[in-house]
Every structure is written in C-alpha cells, then in structure tokens.
C-alpha cells in the first residue's frame, strides 16, 4: 500500500515554535516494538498455489541492512494435481516500506528515511477477460 | 520478513568519534525515493483465489499516518466456479515495516522508529496434513 508524500506537516514543529535548524530533526535511538515478529504459516512460499522464491539484498548503510524480495516462480498457478494452469495468473503483492539510510563524512553521521518497494509474496488471480460487444 | 534487532552498531558513530549526545541522532528532513509507487495489478484483492479486505488505521502521530491492513475474507480458497473450497486455505502474508513515531512536549519534538506488523494480502496454500500412527 502507498505511503503518502511527506510534504505535509508531520516533521515540522508547530507554527508558534522556532523552525528546525539545518533541515534536520532529532531521532531517538532505539526501536519501539523491536521484538515484534512475523508469525506467518510455515513454508507458505512453497505451499502456495502461486509459489515464490526469496532474494536477499544487503546494504550496510541501510537499516534494516537485509531486505528480502519475493519473485513469483510461475506465470500461472499450481492446481491440486501440482500442474501449472496458465488460465490463472501468479501476481506479486507489493508493499511500500520505510528504511533508514545512513550518510557519514568522518565523524558527522546523519540519517534519512527512504521509501523501498518490497514484493512480499504472490497470490493467484483470475484474469478478467470477457467478451465485449 | 524480519527486521533485525537494532542492538548492533548501525546508529552508533565510529568508535574513534565522540558519542551521540542524549541518545539521539540527526535525521534529515525529506524522504529518498518518495515518488516511488506500488504498481500492483488492479483489484487483486477481489480477483485473488484468496481474496481479502482492507482496513485503514489512522494515527496522526505516526508517519505514515495511514497504515493499511489486509484480512483474508475466507478460510478456504475460491475455485473457478466462484465457490469456496475448504480443502485449501487462505493465509495472510505479513511484512515487518518501519514507521516513525512523533513525540512532542510543547516545542520540543522528537521522533522514534517503530516496528509495525502489516498484513499485506493473502495467498492460497495447500494445508499441511500430518498422518499420525
């Protein structure tokens, strides 16, 4: 799903307050709900009728450094007999997510939010094809 | 997919540098790749064999303020005839994502990263059935 543009006032101080110096703001160290964990069914990427593989991308100057991308294995979907049926389509499910980008010059370290598009998995859809007049 | 613990040195300055004052760091305003957009197939939540609905949660002190959560509509999957087949299961696909939490007291505004679990959509899987002696 979409992340809205940051042009609104979320990162601004109230109008009655002095502006943020140097176009930066204070980010507290530590992550709220850091121990929260995904609790998905086991091996759904292999058991799905629209199975997918995972690719890990790694960037030491990004948090999280590891971002996992899914790729649908098939164009069609897998039927009950384990055969691919291309009258159905495996399609990716995407999600916009935030990561933190680290920028440093010597001892001066700053951070910036970055929007990343992650393919989380795949789902099987019926293509909407029909006759028209 | 999982976001690793932040206990590592990502937000720390190099050892040879003076420590970050007051447990906070500098976050530059603006978002990298802000215009990047999800390009998913149209209406996949309705056309999927494991369809889902969306619920929007809103929090003005969170960025993004709007977080969309998916809920699978059925326990089973929808077959070619549009009927639910309970020999297959609709299961949620989850993703850990980061949001920014705003904390303010008067003119003092600070921000903190927060981990949020988002259900992005659903996929149809073959249930794992174990035969026991």
């Amino acid at each position: 799903r979409k992340i809205p543009k940051v042009g609104h006032t979320f990162f601004q101080k109230p109008e009655s307050c002095p502006p943020v110096p140097g176009g930066s703001m204070k980010l507290d160290i530590g992550i709220i709900n850091e121990n929260q964990r995904v609790s998905m069914s086991r091996n759904i990427e292999s058991r799905s009728t629209s199975p997918w593989n995972y690719t890990v991308t790694w960037d030491p100057n990004r948090y999280p450094s590891e971002v996992v991308q899914a790729q649908c294995r098939n164009l069609g979907c897998i039927n009950a007999q384990g055969k691919e049926d291309i009258s159905m389509n495996s399609v990716p499910i995407q999600q916009e997510t935030l990561v933190v980008r680290r920028k440093h010059q010597g001892c001066s370290v700053s951070f910036q939010l970055e929007k990343v598009l992650v393919t989380v998995g795949c789902t099987c859809v019926t293509p909407v094809i029909h006759h028209v007049q | 997919r999982k976001i690793p613990k932040v206990g590592h040195t990502f937000f720390q300055k190099p050892e040879s540098c003076p420590p970050v004052p007051g447990g906070s760091m500098k976050l530059d305003i603006g978002i990298i790749n802000e215009n990047q957009r999800v390009s998913m197939s149209r209406n996949i939540e309705s056309r999927s064999t494991s369809p889902w609905n969306y619920t929007v949660t809103w929090d003005p002190n969170r960025y993004p303020s709007e977080v969309v959560q998916a809920q699978c509509r059925n326990l089973g999957c929808i077959n070619a005839q549009g009927k639910e087949d309970i020999s297959m299961n609709s299961v949620p696909i989850q993703q850990e994502t980061l949001v920014v939490r705003r904390k303010h007291q008067g003119c003092s505004v600070s921000f903190q990263l927060e981990k949020v679990l988002v259900t992005v959509g659903c996929t149809c899987v073959t249930p794992v059935i174990h035969h026991v002696q």
């Epitope: 069609g76 055969k83 691919e84 291309i86 009258s87 399609v91 293509p127 094809i129 028209v132 | -």
Partner: antibody, heavy 124, light 106 residues
C-alpha cells in the same frame, strides 16, 4: 463476436524482414495472453511465441528456432498484436496464426480463438 | 525443451471409438490441450486442462492424462470427425505441440 485478423504476410527474400499484425476485437484484449503459431505447408502446428498479460508483466517467450530473430509486442490501446520477423530463413515459410484462449469470467466457459492466418513465403 | 509424440495416423470405422495417444516424459507435470484441424481451416480447441471440454464441443470427445501418456477419445466416430488432431502443453516454460495425428474415418 470475437475476431482476430492477421495481416502483413508477403513474399520475402532470405535474410529479409517482415512485420505481421493481428487486430483483435470482441473481447478484453489487454487482459488476455496472445500467441503466434505457424504451420508450414503440409506440416503440423508449431508454436512461435507468446506475450502474457499485464497481470504477469507482459512477459514474452519464444520457441527456440525463432529466438533472437523474431520479436513479439502488443499495443493494448489499439488491441493489436505484432510479430517482427528478422533474418528470415526459407524454413520460416508458413501460414502464421494469431491465437488466444482464456476462461471467460462472465460465461464460465473456456474459449479459444484463432485468426484466419497470413501467408509468409521466404524464397530467393 | 521437451517433445510430445503422436502417431502420424489412426484409422477407425464409423460408430467405433477412436483413441489418439500423446506421450511425453513431462506429461505428469503438464496440463494437456487438444486441437482439431480440418484442411484449410484454423484449429479448434476440443479439450483443455487434460479432460475439460468447452461448452460448444460434443460430449463424444473426452480427454485423459495419466503418467507419461495423454489421450483424446472420440466415441461413436462420425465422418465429420476426420481431421488432424494435435496435443499441446502450455505453462511458464512455453508451449509445445505434438506432431499431429491424422484421423481417418473408414
């Protein structure tokens, strides 16, 4: 009524190029997979290639004998499928059919459509 | 790439049952489609997904796929069934046609 009308077939010399078109009507073209199939004189059907729909990213696949020489494309706004044929060989001589088959979500029936074919002759 | 093998010809008398085989090592993992083609005409889909029949096709036509062998069965064969028949598979790896079988109605 569904129609697939191929055009562009011609007599061409070996090494030459040709572009075939297939104009579709009567169904939602943009969401359908489209294929090219050919049939050499007195021979069987041979798959040439296909292009998938938007859902699957418009992926294009080719049969081994034409890979690297032929290129399939589509213009969904004009409901037209194309086959660009380069470096033509005598063995590419055939009737070229444009075809689609799909599950019609309104009628619940699996349907299949072929054009009348366009003749390509590669000869010196 | 894989191959689908069909006999060049099958002959049958009117009213009898004709069985046209199609063999291939990968058939246990593939859905099979069958086409009928008459001289000078475009092919017509007779069977899809191994054994499903489009609504406009006669119930005399049926399909099966077991092991490395698929087959098209035509019961109560009629003169108008004389044609070439092709098996086909279609999946992410591409499309393959069998060499075709000419059905002759004696």
């Amino acid at each position: 009524e569904v129609k697939l009308e191929e055009s562009g077939g011609d007599l061409v010399k070996p090494g030459g190029s040709l572009r075939l078109s297939c104009v579709a009507s009567g169904f939602t073209f943009g969401t359908a997979w489209m294929s090219w199939v050919r049939q050499a004189p007195g021979k069987g059907l041979e798959w040439v290639g296909r292009i998938s729909n938007k859902d699957t990213g418009g992926r294009i696949d080719y049969a081994a004998p034409v890979r690297g020489r032929f290129a399939i494309s589509r213009d969904d706004s004009k409901a037209t499928l194309f086959l660009q044929m380069n470096s033509l060989k005598t063995e590419d001589t055939a009737v070229y059919f444009c075809t689609t088959n799909f599950y019609d979500v309104l009628t619940g029936d699996h349907v299949d459509y072929w054009g009348q074919g366009t003749v390509v002759v590669v000869s010196s | 790439s894989y191959e689908l093998t069909q006999p060049p010809s099958v002959s049958v008398s009117p009213g009898e049952t004709a069985r046209i085989p199609c063999s291939g090592e990968t058939l246990p993992k593939k859905l099979v489609y069958w086409y009928q083609q008459k001289p000078g005409q475009a092919p017509v889909l007779m069977i899809y997904k191994d054994s499903e029949r489009p609504s406009r096709i006669s119930e005399r036509f049926s399909g099966s796929n077991s092991g490395t062998m698929a087959s098209l069965t035509i019961s109560g064969v009629q003169a108008e069934d004389e044609a070439d028949y092709y098996c086909q598979t279609s999946d992410s790896s591409g499309v393959v046609f069998g060499g075709g079988t000419k059905l002759t109605v004696l």
